[in-house]
């Protein structure tokens, strides 16, 4: 009933709660002397389903058979309509449509930790759309049965608040859940278990790691566990890895030695516990311990390369370059590099520690045979030194690689190819491909890059420190014993027409011809490797096509003569630059009038 129902009643048969698909009879009846004033025969009783009129009848009562009600709650209201007045509400009723509960499925119980309490979960099945009460029973030792009711609308979990203890770990407990509503009841299948089956240990805590004598090879992991734990799983990985190493241990008693850790590596460690070999479940993984392993002396050898530069008749500059060891080779923080320079015949040696750089430059006499050795040192020791004899890398013309080419290969890659030298190709022990940004001044401070290639290779893909729209000077060296030959080429990974033309800075007259001088285009405006310069000229105020002279690009060149100008004629001159992608815009314009005698 949803109203005071002073004027009449609404009755529902067979019940206010019905099974989906059932039929109900709804009767609305007026109480005595509650009809329309004077016109009781004109009483019009109307039945509403929510706000929709579904039936009406003249008289003191109305009967309606209703079918097809949906799941959930439906509201019926009975109203009285009299002539010349508003409808009056008589009474109403709610009908609840639902289904009997399905059998609860997958009942499972767990106790989290030895001090935890037993909690059970189950799957309710489809929604009954009715108030449904769940009762969980747990029977066990001492012939006791515990029972707890759940009155939540959607109940699929109950905690008994009982802490099972290991007094008799093999004792059986049986859980069962029963769902009851107005339309029926259903019980789950019983779930039988022992203490060892359902107690899930708490994850281990207080995890620590110790390295005896600061050595990675003598490492012990320590942790704390609940008292009954028998088994542990350890998993660990370098922090930058996704793959875990897994170890199972029995009766570890809170410690385990790890033998395969890499030095100077941050690891993540986690541990899980279990009470019994084949019963019960593993705990959650512990919180992670992150720890760095100690350093060990470096392994491997540095990759060393060098450049020689002639200074004057008696001196030469040697620039040494080396690559960082990989993390796995460095096995610690590299504190310094030790460079030893030695004159082989005189035996004089000079040693220097270099910090913060991977290069070193010195000046040595041009006479004598020189060798260098470079090693890397961390707190535990040094790598084996890399020894190289300083030689003239391009001296042996017959060892020079042939037909060197450099082609763009995708984004920021250059494919360098070559042919073996004419001299017996089998004499080549290795090729070195070297590249550096092309700077017109031949700046020795420009970083040098190189890679080594096996003697049977005739190509190399260079991608390290390659930028788009930058021209690189590329050299291929063939090394054989104490001899070397080299060839060079310019190359870029991506190019477009230069952004500007050269700037003419001077025009001078010399014996009837002129010499044009210009400033190089800034590197960032060249947009790749320059192939040519063009010098254009035409008579001032003339509409004729300009004449031009094309000059192959050479790094060091920044002047060129022109001898086809007429004396006492004023010319306008300008320059452009070309890459493989096209020609730049004009550089500045300069006027010039040749003063020499006419022919």
């Amino acid at each position: 009933k949803i109203d005071a129902c002073k004027r009449g009643d609404v009755t529902v048969k067979p019940s206010h709660v019905i099974l989906l698909g059932s039929t109900v009879n709804i009767t609305c009846s007026l109480k005595p002397r509650q009809g329309c004033f004077h016109y009781s025969r004109r009483n019009k009783l109307i039945l509403y389903k929510f706000d929709r009129r579904i039936n009406f009848h003249h008289g003191h009562s109305l009967n309606s058979q209703v079918t097809g009600l949906p799941l959930g709650t439906t509201l019926f209201v009975c109203k009285l309509a009299c002539i010349n007045s508003d409808e009056i509400q008589i009474c109403g009723a709610e009908i609840f449509v639902g289904v009997a509960p399905e059998q609860p499925q997958n009942l499972s119980c767990i106790q989290k930790g030895e001090q935890g309490t037993v909690a059970c979960t189950w799957e309710r099945g489809r929604d009954t759309h009715l108030y449904t009460e769940y009762t969980l029973q747990l029977s066990g030792p001492k012939n006791l049965t515990w029972q707890k009711q759940c009155k939540d609308i959607y109940c699929d979990y109950l905690d008994f608040g009982i802490n099972l203890t290991p007094e008799s770990p093999e004792s059986n407990f049986t859980a069962k859940v029963t769902a009851v509503n107005s339309l029926g009841s259903s019980s789950s299948l019983p779930s039988t278990f022992t203490f060892l089956d359902i107690v899930r240990p708490l994850p281990p805590w207080d995890i620590r790691i110790k390295f005896q004598k600061a050595s990675v090879s003598r490492c012990t992991l320590y942790w704390r566990d609940e008292g009954l734990v028998l088994l542990n799983r350890l998993r660990y990985r370098p922090s930058n890895s996704r793959l875990w190493n897994m170890v199972n241990v029995t009766k570890a008693k809170g410690r385990h030695d790890l033998l395969d850790l890499k030095p100077f590596t941050e690891y993540e460690f986690q541990i899980s516990s279990k009470l019994h070999l084949y019963k019960g479940s593993w705990s959650d993984w512990s919180e992670s311990l992150r720890a760095q392993t100690p350093e060990e002396e470096p392994t491997g050898m540095l990759d060393v390369w060098y450049m020689k530069r002639h200074i004057d008749y008696s001196r030469q500059q040697i620039s040494l370059f080396w690559k960082n060891l990989s993390v796995s080779e460095a096995r610690g923080k590299i504190l310094h590099y030790q460079v030893t320079l030695q004159e082989l015949t005189g035996g004089k040696a000079m040693t220097q520690n270099i910090t913060g750089h991977t290069s070193w430059t010195t000046v040595i006499p041009r006479t004598g045979n020189w060798a260098v050795a470079v090693s890397a040192a961390n707190s535990k020791g040094s790598s084996l030194p890399t020894r190289i004899n300083i030689m003239n890398l391009c001296e042996a013309g017959l060892l020079a690689p042939r037909q060197v080419s450099a082609n763009s290969e995708g984004m920021d890659n250059i494919l360098v190819t070559w042919q073996p030298p004419r001299k017996d190709p089998s004499a080549v022990q290795e090729y070195v491909v070297e590249w550096r940004e092309l700077h017109p001044g031949g700046d020795t401070q420009v970083p040098l890059n190189w890679l080594r290639s096996r003697p049977y290779n005739v190509s190399a893909l260079i991608s390290e420190n390659i930028k788009s729209y930058i021209c690189y000077e590329i050299r291929v060296y063939a090394l054989s014993g104490d001899q070397g030959g080299c060839s060079s080429i310019l190359g870029n990974s991506k190019h477009k027409a230069p952004l500007s033309g050269p700037h003419i800075n001077a025009i001078t007259e010399e014996k009837g011809s002129i010499l044009i001088s210009w400033n190089s285009i800034p590197v960032q405006e060249q947009m790749g490797c320059l192939l040519h310069y063009r010098i254009y000229w035409k008579e001032r105020d003339s509409n004729s096509q300009p004449q031009l002279c094309e000059i192959p690009y050479r790094v060091s060149q920044n002047s060129h003569p022109i001898n086809s100008l007429q004396p006492r004629v004023t010319y306008v001159l300008w320059m452009t630059a070309l890459t493989a992608a096209g020609e730049s815009s004009h550089g500045n314009e300069r006027e010039f009038c040749l003063q020499g005698k006419a022919n």
Epitope: G140, W146, K148, G161, I162, N163
Partner: nanobody
């Protein structure tokens, strides 16, 4: 101090029903659980049923499960034992007991032990005739 008073006992025929009541008075705020025990002539006292005050969890001995049901009325600080389908072997003095242990009902093995309960009623006689 906490006092417990049982009522509702008497003589009943086999197959009949009785409802025992146990009213607590005094320091009732300290109650964490209440239970019913029974003692037949010439036998030891045995556990019948108990209820945890905080959440209404019930514990029944399997020997009475389905016939004897414990319930409570928090507002009245009263616990009931509804006894159905009574048998002559149900004849005994029925005692009400209470505990002020906040951990009551955490341990499976102590909930049915008399030592768990610190407060006891005088008992009410139930006689089932055949």
């Amino acid at each position: 101090q906490l006092q417990l008073v049982e009522s509702g006992g008497g003589l009943v025929q086999a197959g009949g029903s009785l409802r025992l009541s146990c009213a607590a008075s005094g320091r009732t705020f300290g109650i964490h659980g209440m239970g019913w025990f029974r003692q037949a002539p010439g036998k030891e006292r045995e556990f019948a049923a108990a209820i945890r005050w905080s959440d209404g969890t019930t514990i029944h001995a399997d020997s009475v499960k389905g016939r004897l049901t414990i319930s409570r009325d928090n507002a009245k600080n009263t616990v009931y034992l509804q006894m159905n389908s009574l048998k002559p072997e149900d004849t005994a003095v029925y005692y009400c007991a209470a505990t002020s242990n906040p951990q009551f009902g955490r341990n499976w093995y102590t909930v049915a032990a008399g030592v768990e309960y610190g407060y006891w009623g005088q008992g009410t006689q139930v006689t089932v005739s055949s």
